[in-house]
Interface confidence: medium
């Protein structure tokens, strides 16, 4: 278990042309908070995931009244840190968002506004118990400085927080193998926390004396990898010697979820789903009111009339969530008809239609065929957006306009000879083939292989193609 | 489709109490606080209470709040509402009500009418 | 609680008409009011929420306006299915409260 501390040292205008415009004026007073967001790992999620390893949100600074005409200074800041407490070991790795809020302090009908002035993210790496780490970020015109560390909550050391500490049992030295607890000179490291023989690839533990696998590994130390065949328990397999898990506690069992959080279970541990107004791993952080703007992207808080009521967030068009911290990917229901692009401006919809298509949804399908003919006796023919022409014997092209060569494809068969007619072809068959392209040969006894030959038509005659 | 089913009616005595369903089908039914209504007969709409079904918070109209008692079956996507200590002013329809992603209650149950007599 | 009063109980107009029905808050609610429909068999529909925006499926002939405490729904082109009552509600502060209804029905 351990705390990571954020130190906000100022936030104003960055370097370089374009300094932004002061964010409270003399009509419009206002002060600062800041939120910070946690996550394990080196995770490139999208802003809304959740904080897993925690979050906080500070003070209201002081309140800040732009002076006319002054370019917009360093602004004041609350006091103290933010602090995040994590429960399990620190990760190393973790990613951060830390959010400038401003609250808006003027004649605001139903209390005050908030607004997102900026936000910044990143990467780090990071060993607790290490020195304060120093950062300055940017968002747009803006500049975030500020330090951060992690450090362990007593009995926890380690640059994990994973190793525990205790006070010396003899004043000289440490136990056989022990070794003295720094920074805590005048304390030992304790015995290893794990069962002894649990595997070190495979397995893990929180609490001192356990073993708990990693998933694809299972036995009490561990050592079995997992075979998914003949397993029929509802866990999984059900003995190490099969190397099928065993049913045994699951990190949800006896719910480590306090403040009435709901538990699932995940591949190392488990995950809390809190109740509104509590937060942190095991859901054992309380109190958040709307006085602690829960709600971002400008939601309106609304809240109970004692704390045992929830609080709810009122988002505004293009956001939602509990804390209205999810913008709503409104093209993905698909909103567009008829193959329309689909643009989210944040404060509308639009819908860029494909040709022949129009209205605000691309829903309206324009008359392809209006106002254009067809030449020579062709028929117009709507469709995707497009009109077409189905052209009358002996005339092609788009409008019907061409003339067509019915012999150009040489539609023939067997060297026969094609001729232009009015209504078509006519192809004159070579000896020994007949049909409307020649298609069939003649037998030598003089039958054909047509199942009848036209009346009228003797094999070797020109026949017209209709 | 959205659909929230409410029985048609409860008759009850005064004195009981009478726990109300409404039954919602056609969309995620954790992920949406769930309204409750009253409509007295020839009267307008008056709000009760709001429950959200994953995280079972509850929200109550303080004149209500000795009256109603809000709950969920997650697993039948189902949300309740108990009446306690009947009396005829309790006489009236009930409705649930999604509150949408916008917050409007966006779709609405039948309502159940519920009558307390003797 | 914050009142919502709506000053015509009811109104008649006819076919092809454009009705206005006004609702006024007891204190400023920025802009956080739905507007209902409940049709004489009881069923209960959206209009418009946050002022005005159009619900889903619902025909443009309605629209929303106001802002502060003033708020008024319209229906710029009256037809027959339209006979209802019509609530106004605000979602500002709890406990939400509703408009005392206006009933429209056709000359």
């Known amino acids: 278990a351990g705390v990571f501390e954020l130190q906000i040292h100022s936030f104003g205008p960055g370097p370089g042309p374009g300094a932004p415009r002061s964010p409270c004026s003399a009509r419009l007073p206002c002060r600062l908070f800041f939120r910070v967001c946690l996550k394990p790992g080196l995770s490139e999620e999208a802003a809304e995931s959740p904080c897993a390893l925690g979050a906080a949100l500070s003070a209201r600074g002081p309140v800040y009244t732009e002076q006319p005409g002054a370019p917009a200074p360093d602004l004041p800041l609350p006091d103290g840190l933010l602090q995040v407490p994590f429960r399990d070991a620190w990760p190393g790795t973790f990613s951060f968002i830390i959010e400038t809020w401003r609250e808006e302090l003027g004649d605001q009908i139903g209390g005050p506004a908030w607004s997102l002035l900026a936000r910044v993210a990143g990467r780090r790496r990071l060993a607790a118990g290490g020195p304060w780490a120093r950062d300055i970020q940017r968002a747009g015109a803006w500049e975030l400085r500020f330090s951060y560390r992690a450090r362990c909550e007593p009995p926890a050391v380690g640059t994990a927080c994973t190793r525990l500490c205790r006070p010396r049992s003899a004043p000289s030295r440490c136990g056989p193998g022990l070794r003295p607890c720094a920074p805590l000179e005048d304390e030992c490291e304790a015995p290893l926390v794990c069962r002894a023989g649990c595997s070190p690839e495979h397995g893990f533990c929180e609490q001192p004396g356990e073993c708990r696998c990693l998933e694809g590994w299972t036995g009490p130390l561990c050592t079995v990898p997992v075979s998914t065949s003949s397993c029929l328990s509802p866990r999984g397999p059900s003995s190490a010697t099969t190397g099928c898990l065993v049913p045994g506690p699951g990190p949800c069992d006896g719910n480590p979820c306090a403040n009435g959080g709901s538990c699932s279970e995940t591949p190392r541990s488990f995950e809390c789903t809190c109740p509104r107004g509590f937060y942190g791993l095991r859901c054992e952080v309380s109190g958040v009111t709307c006085a602690d703007g829960p709600c971002f992207n400008g939601g309106l808080c609304v809240g109970g009339a004692d704390p045992d009521s929830a609080y709810i967030c009122h988002c505004p068009p293009g956001f939602q969530g509990s804390n209205c911290e999810k913008r709503v990917d409104r093209c993905s229901l698909q909103p567009c008809r008829n193959g329309g692009l689909c643009l989210d401006l944040g404060h509308a919809l639009r819908c860029r239609c494909r040709a022949g298509f129009a209205g605000p949804r691309c829903e309206h399908d324009l008359d392809d065929c209006a106002g254009r003919a067809c030449a020579n006796g062709g028929t117009c023919v709507e469709g995707g957006g497009a009109h077409r022409c189905s052209c009358a014997l002996g005339f092609g092209g788009r409008d019907c306009r061409e003339r067509a060569d019915p012999c150009a494809a040489r539609p023939c068969a067997h060297g026969g000879r094609c001729y232009a007619h009015f209504s078509g072809l006519v192809c004159a068959c070579a000896p020994g083939y007949m049909g409307a392209r020649c298609e069939f040969p003649v037998h030598p006894d003089g039958a054909s292989a047509l199942p009848a030959a036209p009346p009228g038509l003797r094999p070797g005659d020109p026949q017209r193609y209709l | 489709q959205v659909q929230l089913q409410q029985p048609g009616a409860e008759l009850v005595k005064p004195g009981a109490s009478v726990k109300l369903s409404c039954k919602a089908s056609?969309?995620?039914?954790?992920?949406?606080?769930m309204h409750w209504v009253k409509q007295r007969p020839g009267q307008g709409l008056e709000w009760i209470g709001m429950?959200?079904?994953?995280?079972?918070?509850?929200n109550y109209n303080e004149k209500f709040k000795s009256k109603a008692t809000l709950t969920v079956d997650k697993s039948s996507s189902t949300a309740y509402m108990e009446l306690s200590s009947l009396t005829s002013e309790d006489s009236a329809v009930y409705y649930c009500?999604?509150?949408?992603?916008?917050?409007?209650?966006?779709?609405w149950g039948q309502g159940t009418s519920v009558t307390v007599s003797s | 609680d914050i009142q919502m009063t709506q000053t015509t109980s009811s109104l008649s107009a006819s076919l092809g008409d454009r009705v206005t029905i006004s609702c006024s808050a007891s204190q400023g609610i920025s802009n956080y009011l739905n507007w209902y429909q409940q049709k004489p068999d009881g069923t209960v529909k959206l209009l418009i929420y946050y002022t005005s925006s159009l619900h889903s499926g619902v025909p443009a002939r309605f629209s929303g306006s106001g802002s502060g405490t003033d708020y008024s729904l319209t229906i710029s082109n009256l037809e027959p299915e339209d006979i209802a009552i019509y609530y106004c509600?605000?979602?500002?502060?709890?406990?939400?409260?509703f408009g005392g209804g206006t009933k429209l029905e056709i000359k």
């Open positions: 009500a999604r509150l949408g992603s916008l917050s409007m209650m966006d779709y």
């Open positions: 429950i959200h079904p994953t995280l079972g918070d509850t």
């Open positions: 509600q605000q979602y500002s502060k709890f406990p939400y409260t």
């Open positions: 056609g969309y995620s039914f954790t992920s949406y606080w």
